[in-house]
Interface confidence: medium
């Protein structure tokens, strides 16, 4: 029962995580205009992986896609790739894990096959989560670098009087969504891998013994009944299943580019 619960919970947690990774990838607020210590402008800039947007005070929002592939920074391309790989792996993992779920019967699929599929999907979720976390972290690092670079030359004197304020960008909501979603996918994957151990049929350390009675020939194999039903308790692994996944905290981001040249 604990195996089924762990597997089911791992599947649900991974599903939520992958949905979050997809959401983060599509979101426009990967970087948002830093409002601290800046003159108050009537426009708010923010950027995603695919387009940059400007929200004006009147409520009008204008977004422009990055219609170039070669002109974009290699780091941005790398982040895009990591997020897409994460989504693809996660989606395949979800597909595999559906068939691996213990509560779903498909033909005469053996527990060993389900165990293998559960392990495969678990590994896929782990890699998917790591891809998302890596992608978001690379972007965050890029932002931090650009932030301090633009702070260093924030005010460029022109004739002593004119000041050109450089727009600085800070972490957008998508980064926090991505980190949390990647973490959930990772946790879900670990849970699937744990569930796999419970699904695998227990191997015996001794061979079957034949007992010969007069006039009868009966072979008794220890554990045979347990393997044929789905109700055997796996005492060896029981202590593993003691709780569900939980995120440490929920991060809120303030709701408009490090310039892509």
């Amino acid at each position: 029962m604990a195996v089924t619960a762990c597997q089911g919970l791992g599947f649900v947690v991974s599903l939520i995580g992958i949905a979050g990774i997809i959401a983060a990838t599509c979101m426009d607020q990967w970087s948002t205009q830093d409002l601290y210590n800046n003159p108050v402008t009537a426009v708010f800039n923010y950027q995603g992986l695919w387009r940059s947007c400007v929200r004006e005070s009147s409520g009008f929002t204008e977004c422009r896609g990055y219609f170039t592939l070669l002109g974009l920074p290699a780091m941005l391309q790398a982040v895009r790739a990591l997020m897409i790989v994460g989504i693809v792996l996660g989606a395949i993992g979800l597909l595999v894990s559906i068939f691996a779920l213990k509560c779903i019967r498909i033909g005469s699929m053996e527990d060993s096959a389900k165990a293998n599929m559960t392990l495969t999907s678990g590994i896929m979720f782990i890699v998917s989560g790591l891809c998302a976390i890596a992608g978001v972290s690379v972007f965050a690092n890029m932002l931090v670098t650009n932030f301090w670079m633009s702070t260093a030359n924030m005010y460029t004197g022109m004739g002593g009087m004119v000041q050109t304020v450089q727009t600085r960008y800070t972490f957008g909501a998508a980064l926090f969504v991505g980190w949390v979603a990647g973490g959930l996918t990772l946790i879900g994957g670990v849970m699937m891998c744990i569930a796999c151990r419970g699904l695998a049929p227990e191997e015996t350390n001794y061979k079957a013994v034949s007992y010969h009675a007069s006039g009868h020939s009966v072979a008794y194999k220890p554990g045979g009944f347990k393997a044929s039903t789905g109700f055997g308790s796996n005492t060896k692994n029981k202590k593993i299943y003691d709780g569900g996944a939980r995120t440490e905290d929920e991060v809120q981001s303030y709701p408009s580019k490090h310039d892509y040249v």
């Epitope: 205009q33 003159p39 108050v40 402008t41 009537a42 426009v43 800039n45 923010y46 950027q47 940059s52 947007c53 400007v54 004006e56 005070s57 009147s58 409520g59 009008f60 204008e62 422009r64 004119v162 000041q163 050109t164 304020v165 450089q166 727009t167 408009s256 580019k257 310039d259």
Partner: antibody
Framework: QVQLKESGPGLVAPSQSLSITCTVS????????VHWVRQPPGKGLEWLGV???????NFNSALMSRLSISKDNSKNQVFLKMNSLQSDDTAMYYC????????????WGQGTTLTVS | DIVMTQSPSSLSVSAGEKVTMSCKSS????????????LAWYQQKPGQPPKLLIY???TRESGVPDRFTGSGSGTDFTLTISSVQAEDLAVYYC?????????FGSGTKLEIK
């Protein structure tokens, strides 16, 4: 067609309060922002504040403590209230429509004269 | 607050002449997000409210004669009247449309000889 018309008291005693109403027609206050601008006699234009379509308000920081802007979308009216009036508040007060932000103030009222004396 | 400096404060020209007036901002009015300059030019004739001529530094408002041209980016902007007409007698104001408060320049008074 688009029209804006200001109406005010004309003459106000020092330290008193002022209330000017801008009645608009030809457009909706839920779609466009309205700005207030004043012009002292023989001087330049001074931006006072704006109330955006969504209801958010921005003021000239120098006058922020004395100003308030509100609107009644159903009556198509925008209100400018200003307290602790001094003689240097004597000016022509205009309301102007923001077509949408970044496109400038495309329609202006004829203005209402305020004399603080 | 952003300071908008207009020059010259006044100028007198003959009809048909080309006129150029300048507007300088104490901070850049160019938004990097959409590469748009948030600056507007207004014309105010005696006894009338201001009239919008140019927005976004260079886009002519509909109905404005094509002799009026706006140019510039960042902190330096120019309004050019290619061939001044008698009806162009007015004061011309530039306005910062980017930073709050939306400050106006002190104006350039155009007189016709």
């Amino acid at each position: 067609q688009v029209q804006l018309k200001e109406s005010g008291p004309g003459l106000v005693a020092p330290s008193q309060s002022l209330s000017i109403t801008c009645t608009v027609s030809g457009f909706s206050l839920t779609s466009h922002g309205v700005h207030w601008v004043r012009q002292p006699p023989g001087k330049g234009l001074e931006w006072l504040g704006v109330i955006w379509a969504g209801g958010s308000i921005n003021f000239n920081s120098a006058l922020m403590s004395r100003l308030s802007i509100s609107k009644d979308n159903s009556k198509n009216q925008v209100f400018l209230k200003m307290n602790s009036l001094q003689s240097d508040d004597t000016a022509m007060y205009y309301c102007a429509r923001d077509y949408y932000y970044g496109i400038g103030l495309d329609y202006w009222g004829q203005g209402t004269t305020l004399t603080v004396s | 607050d952003i300071v908008m400096t207009q020059s010259p404060s006044s100028l007198s020209v003959s009809a048909g002449e080309k006129v150029t007036m300048s507007c300088k901002s104490s901070q850049s009015l160019l938004n990097s997000g959409n590469q748009k300059n948030y600056l507007a030019w207004y014309q105010q004739k005696p006894g009338q409210p201001p009239k919008l001529l140019i927005y976004g530094a260079s886009t002519r408002e509909s109905g404005v004669p094509d002799r009026f041209t706006g140019s510039g980016s960042g902190t330096d902007f120019t309004l050019t009247i290619s061939s001044v007409q008698a009806e162009d007698l007015a004061v011309y104001y530039c306005q910062n449309d980017y930073y709050y408060p939306f400050t106006f320049g002190s104006g350039t008074k155009l007189e016709i000889k």
